[in-house]
Amino acid sequence: SPVPPSTALKELIEELVNITQNQKAPLCNGSMVWSINLTAGVYCAALESLINVSGCSAIEKTQRMLNGFCPHKVSAGQFSSLRVRDTKIEVAQFVKDLLVHLKKLFREGQFN
């Protein structure tokens, strides 16, 4: 049976916690990704940004989980208007920012 949205979001949050906690070397070798607007469509926008990082096993599970939240197909190189124009940040900072935002969404009951 499908996982309730609240459970899925909780699991995504916990996965992001694990990523930030287990950082030994720079996450994804210090790869940079496009910063996103966190106010709307955050799951698809986050996936569109992170999908461009390849060969980084640490975020593969996060990419799969975000895919489950995003209603449309996302492929590398694709980017919506949710990108913050010409601003790139390290994957580690992207994950930290995303984590705090998702915790706030969970508090607000915005599970999908």
Partner: antibody, heavy 122, light 108 residues
Framework: QMQLVESGGGVVQPGRSLTLSCAAS????????MHWVRQAPGKGLEWVGV????????HYADSVKGRFTITRDNSKNTLNLQMNSLRAEDTAVYYC???????????????WGQGTMVTVSS | SYVLTQPPSVSVAPGETATITCGGN??????VHWYQQKPGQAPVLVIY???DRPSRIPERFSGSNIGNTATLTIEDVEAGDEADYYC???????????FGGGTKLTVL
């Protein structure tokens, strides 16, 4: 200015009851979750309970569950804490505090009252 | 129920940096708030939602929350920062708000 003022504290015998009140002013009371927090002499902060903005939900700490009841009157901007079957370990300063209300009550307490002392002693 | 662990005391010289920790199982998955309480006064919110700062709180105060530890950092400590500091989270599993035991910050 925004203010919370507690009242109703005092000395009460074990097993008896007491009701504390918290009067809110300077903000839209009905849009905030309201909490009670207590602090025994020389000890840390202990959360007592919360009532949602519309009064539809309450949650309590295990230590007071079944003995304490939180109510509110949004038309009068007041919060109440009815304390029954009081014990010596309930002796503390009692604070009311507000927190913006979301789906879950995980918000920080951005406004506190000055506190009212409750002493449970025979 | 959920438990938050703080060191009972932290001492620091004026001008130095104070670090106060708050430990909890996977606390990084929760939003952490920090309060300052001076003797005889009500607590005051100094950090909310892990790292946000109310407008009236100096930039010297900052917060972080990773893994099993949340941290309150006070840079360039002043005598006026001497107080008790408490961390706080909402425990979704028990529908209760939880405070840490508190840390007494002493400015030497």
């Amino acid at each position: 200015q925004m203010q919370l003022v507690e009242s109703g504290g005092g000395v009460v015998q074990p097993g008896r009851s007491l009701t504390l009140s918290c009067a809110a002013s300077g903000f839209e009371f009905r849009t905030y979750g309201m909490h009670w927090v207590r602090q025994a002499p020389g000890k840390g902060l202990e959360w007592v309970g919360v009532i949602w903005d519309d009064g539809s939900n309450t949650h309590y700490a295990d230590s007071v569950k079944g003995r304490f009841t939180i109510t509110r009157d949004n038309s009068k901007n007041t919060l109440n804490l009815q304390m029954n079957s009081l014990r010596a370990e309930d002796t503390a300063v009692y604070y009311c505090a507000r927190a913006p209300q979301w789906y879950l009550t995980a918000e920080a307490f951005d406004l506190w009252g000055q506190g009212t002392m409750v002493t449970v002693s025979s | 129920s959920y438990v938050l662990t703080q060191p009972p005391s932290v001492s620091v010289a004026p001008g130095e940096t104070a670090t106060i920790t708050c430990g909890g199982n996977l606390i990084g998955a929760k939003l952490v708030h920090w309060y300052q309480q001076k003797p005889g006064q009500a607590p005051v919110l100094v950090i909310y939602d892990d790292s946000d700062r109310p407008s009236r709180i100096p930039e010297r105060f900052s917060g972080s929350n990773i893994g099993n530890t949340a941290t309150l950092t006070i840079e360039d400590v002043e005598a006026g920062d001497e107080a008790d500091y408490y961390c706080q989270v909402w425990d979704y599993s028990s529908d209760t708000m939880v405070f840490g035991g508190g840390t007494k910050l002493t400015v030497l």
